[in-house]
Interface confidence: low
Amino acid sequence: AGTPPGKAFNLTWISTDFKTILEWQPKPTNYTYTVQISDRSRNWKYKCTGTTDTECDLTDEIVKDVNWTYEARVLSYPAGNVESTGSAGEPLYENSPEFTPYLETNLGQPTIQSFEQVGTKVNVTVEDERTLVRRNNTFLSLRDVFGKDLIYTLYYWKSSSSGKKTAKTNTNEFLIDVDKGENYCFSVQAVIPSRTVNRKSTDSPVECMGQEKGEFRE
């Protein structure tokens, strides 16, 4: 049996650095959608009521506890009547997969904030990206949330060659040895080694010595 007309399908969580959107199909014709998400008390909270979109931003809900495992469902109603129900007296609905933000949100592309050369050492600093997770009315950074679960891998190479070296850190800083008089290029990747899925971010944009971000000191 196929999906009943009006019933949502392909419910998918799209989440990066805790910005979290539930997407689904199909585009509605003559009906609207309402999303529900279960909170920590297992109550269903209404979101995106009566929408004709096929996505719903659930960030505000999931950042309340990023370690919690959330479920959502998409309810379908005939257009103009959010009280209409299916044959069993319930609106048509489809459940999402479970979603645990801490374990599953994608790591966004990191950014190299700066690099500074002192003699034959270079200190490379990764920007500590702000997330939408709040505590005491302030937004936490990625490091605040993940702590030592988050590492960064630095790829670096001489501008004149293609042979890459790597370094890892549990902070947002690298201190690496370089050859004096050589220019180097850098790219970083965020990694959460303890994860089974979504372990790595995409690589940051490449930054090279001799460009604006760097600073050189003898």
Partner: antibody, heavy 125, light 108 residues
Framework: QVQLQESGPGLVKPSQTLSLTCTVS?????????WSWIRQHPGKGLEWIGE???????RYNPSLKSRVTISVDTSKNQFSLKLSSVTAADTAVYYC??????????????????WGKGTTVTVSS | EIVLTQSPGTLSLSPGERATLSCRAS???????LAWYQQKPGQAPRLLIY???SRATGIPDRFSGSGSGTDFTLTISRLEPEDFAVYYC?????????FGGGTKVEIK
């Protein structure tokens, strides 16, 4: 100098919930460390229970996970342990400790450098 | 979980002698996450060594740590009377964090 002090009832009845609090003095609980609970059964070795980061992220020992909750109250500079459905096997000295990150030459090192004195909890009716 | 096996269980030595304590892991442990603690009766553990080989603040240089991978060693070059205690190794790299069973260094 950071100091830790455990507090809570020394006697808990079987099937009840053990509740302990660790108060951090001489420093901020939000300063980037993890905060752990460890226990030691009489005459035995040390067992790590779990830890919390000030942002609320937790890790638990899988052997205790179903019964353990660790929480943090940054306004009081405290973190707490709750262990439910206790039995005589939970009788132990309970320690809180600071799990410190130490950055050196491109790497991070972790170790528990500050411990509370420990509090003895007996489970008995 | 990573099981840390310490040997010997008890070491009987005299003051001035050298003590060598072993900690073997069931799987490889990053040395960044390997620490040694000393515990005396009625007291909390005290950090001696972190990162497998770095002495904690205030720890005398007669204590040294070494090793990598699965084999780690704590050495006390010349035992002082206050060194007689139980010593634990610990890994804080993989959950659950685990301690070895301890080695008791007692006066012969």
């Amino acid at each position: 100098q950071v100091q830790l002090q455990e507090s809570g009832p020394g006697l808990v009845k079987p099937s009840q919930t053990l509740s302990l609090t660790c108060t951090v003095s001489g420093g901020s609980i939000s300063s980037g460390q993890y905060w752990s609970w460890i226990r030691q059964h009489p005459g035995k070795g040390l067992e790590w229970i779990g830890e919390i980061y000030y942002s609320g992220s937790t890790r638990y020992n899988p052997s205790l996970k179903s019964r353990v909750t660790i929480s943090v109250d940054t306004s009081k500079n405290q973190f707490s342990l709750k262990l439910s459905s206790v039995t005589a096997a939970d009788t132990a000295v309970y320690y809180c400790a600071r799990d410190t990150p130490y950055y050196y030459d491109g790497g991070y090192y972790y170790y528990m450098d500050v411990w509370g004195k420990g509090t003895t909890v007996t489970v008995s009716s | 979980e990573i099981v840390l096996t310490q040997s010997p269980g008890t070491l009987s030595l005299s003051p001035g002698e050298r003590a060598t304590l072993s900690c073997r892991a069931s799987q490889s442990v990053s040395s960044s996450y390997l620490a040694w603690y000393q515990q005396k009766p009625g007291q909390a553990p005290r950090l001696l060594i972190y990162g497998a080989s770095s002495r904690a603040t205030g720890i005398p240089d007669r204590f040294s740590g070494s090793g990598s991978g699965t084999d780690f060693t704590l050495t006390i070059s010349r035992l002082e009377p206050e060194d007689f205690a139980v010593y634990y190794c610990q890994q804080v790299g993989v959950v659950p964090y685990t301690f070895g069973g301890g080695t008791k260094v007692e006066i012969k």
